[in-house]
């Protein structure tokens, strides 16, 4: 969380933003709020990033004001309108991309005063694996697959009857390019899996840390997932 | 309220050029994009181009090398301009705008323009 | 390009039957899905966006879903006034791109 405050002047107000992270190829939320104000006239709403030249997005006399948007964001991004009054500056940002990483800046003026505080986007791509029994394998087998990563995870296995065994001598992990030819497909698989345990596969990297399970006894077999983005921290 | 109207020449002679004025009210070139679709007789919608606020603008890969569009802010116009045109540019020739800064969809459209081309 | 492929063409239906439209991408379009009704010499009218978002004053009967590659566009209850061509167009990424559109007749 950072929390930034305006400086000389008007008073400063107090300006909060989350980093997060975006899926690329999907949307994303760049989060921010401010101390609202009565009059939705009063309020300009500023997103900048570093090393860019134009606007990112402004808002501005209750609508949007683009003509100094950038090239780069054109078409492509959005305040929640209807929440800017209660001191909701978000950005919604359509379709990722890996260049949309940096550090943004939202900017806040009010009847009360100023203030802005900056925010760290990273980018990259993560999805939920999926762990089944391999039935095509000569020998009790697990594959672990998730669609979707960037830049490249490390995948390890776990149990949970055999904790803290190391399963790298018989797990064999593969990295496939998607067609867009930046994320890849993660498939992993397990050899010599024992009946009544659970295991887990885990894909991590920089921004996401992602967890499959499967409990697999003789009369059924138990499913879960579960992903979790790093480093989301408030200003 | 809301509205945006074509104006354009109805009849192009075969390897002439087609210019339509798309005059809008109720909202700023500055906080909207503008975008162009036609659809000729009986068949589907086929997106041209859009004219963003800042004046960037993005074309239809198939009309690149014969299409343009600019604007006049202060005038709320959007201009449109193709070349070289022939029988299968006979047309109606929209100009419309998305729902929000995001295009999600084509809330408002103009009337349209019937362009012909024809000798 | 994103191909936007309709089905069907057309279809013939009685008042108050329940129809489904289909649309599909040729790849991911998320949920940068539109759908338009567009009735004799008038132009196209916002019926859904987003996938599933309802367009202000579109009647409840018409219903939006899907997403990624795969999407509908449900009439509840078709009424005589609902006779039109209805298409779906993607705004994920350029060319923006309609399906050839599907064009519902009342029996």
């Known amino acids: 969380l950072i929390i930034g405050f305006g400086i000389s002047g008007r008073h400063s107000i107090t300006v909060t933003t989350v980093a997060s992270a975006g899926n690329i190829g999907e949307d994303g939320i760049l989060s921010c709020t401010f101390e609202p104000d009565i009059k939705l006239s009063d309020i300009v709403i500023q997103w900048l990033k570093e090393g860019v030249l134009g606007l990112v997005h402004e808002f501005k006399e209750g609508k949007d004001e683009l003509s100094e948007q950038d090239e780069m964001f054109r078409g492509r991004t959005a305040v929640f309108a209807d929440q800017v009054i209660v001191g909701n500056a978000s950005l919604r940002l359509k379709n990722v991309q890996l260049t949309d990483a940096g550090t943004y800046k939202c900017y806040i003026i009010t009847s009360k005063g100023k203030g802005n505080a900056n925010l760290e986007y990273k980018t990259g791509a993560f999805s939920m694996p999926e762990v089944n029994v391999d039935y095509n394998a000569s020998s009790e087998t697990l594959r672990c697959e998730a669609p979707r990563w960037f830049p490249q995870p490390t995948v390890v296995w776990a149990s949970q009857v055999d904790q803290g065994a190391n399963f790298s001598e018989v797990s064999n992990t593969s990295f496939e390019l998607n067609s867009e030819n930046v994320t890849m497909k993660v498939v992993s698989v397990l050899y010599n899996v024992t009946i009544n345990n659970t295991y887990s596969c885990m894909i991590e990297n920089d921004i996401a840390k992602a967890t499959g399970d499967i409990k697999v006894t003789e009369s059924e077999i138990k499913r879960r997932s579960h992903l979790q983005l790093l480093n989301s921290k408030a200003s | 309220q809301i509205q945006l109207k074509e104006s354009g020449p109805g009849l192009v002679q075969p390897s002439q050029s087609l210019s339509i004025t798309c005059t809008v009210s109720g909202f700023s070139l500055t906080s909207y994009g503008v975008h162009w679709v036609r659809q000729s007789p009986g068949k589907g919608l086929e997106w041209l181009g859009v004219?963003?606020?800042?004046?960037?603008?993005d074309y239809n890969s198939a009309f690149i090398s014969r299409l343009s569009i600019s604007k006049d802010n202060s005038k709320s116009q959007v201009f449109f301009k193709m070349n070289s045109l022939q029988a299968d540019d006979t047309a109606i020739y929209y100009c419309?705008?998305?729902?929000?800064?995001?295009?999600?969809?084509?809330?408002?459209w103009g009337q349209g323009t019937l362009v012909t081309v024809s000798a | 390009i994103i191909v936007m492929t309709q089905s069907p063409k057309s279809m013939s239906m009685s008042v108050g039957e329940r129809i489904t439209l289909n649309c599909k991408a040729s790849?991911?379009?998320?949920?940068?899905v539109s759908w338009y009704q567009q009735k004799p010499e008038q132009s196209p009218k916002l019926l859904i966006y987003?996938?599933?978002n309802r367009y202000t004053g579109v009647p409840d009967h018409f219903t939006g879903s899907g997403s990624a590659t795969d999407f509908t566009l449900t009439i509840s209850s078709v009424q005589a006034e609902d006779l039109a061509d209805y298409h779906c167009?993607?705004?994920?990424?350029?060319?923006?791109?309609f399906g050839s559109g599907t064009k519902l007749e009342i029996k």
């Open positions: 790849e991911n379009v998320g949920t940068y």
């Open positions: 167009g993607q705004t994920y990424s350029y060319p923006f791109t």
């Open positions: 004219i963003w606020s800042g004046g960037y603008t």
């Open positions: 987003g996938a599933s």
């Open positions: 419309a705008r998305d729902i929000t800064t995001i295009v999600e969809g084509f809330a408002y």
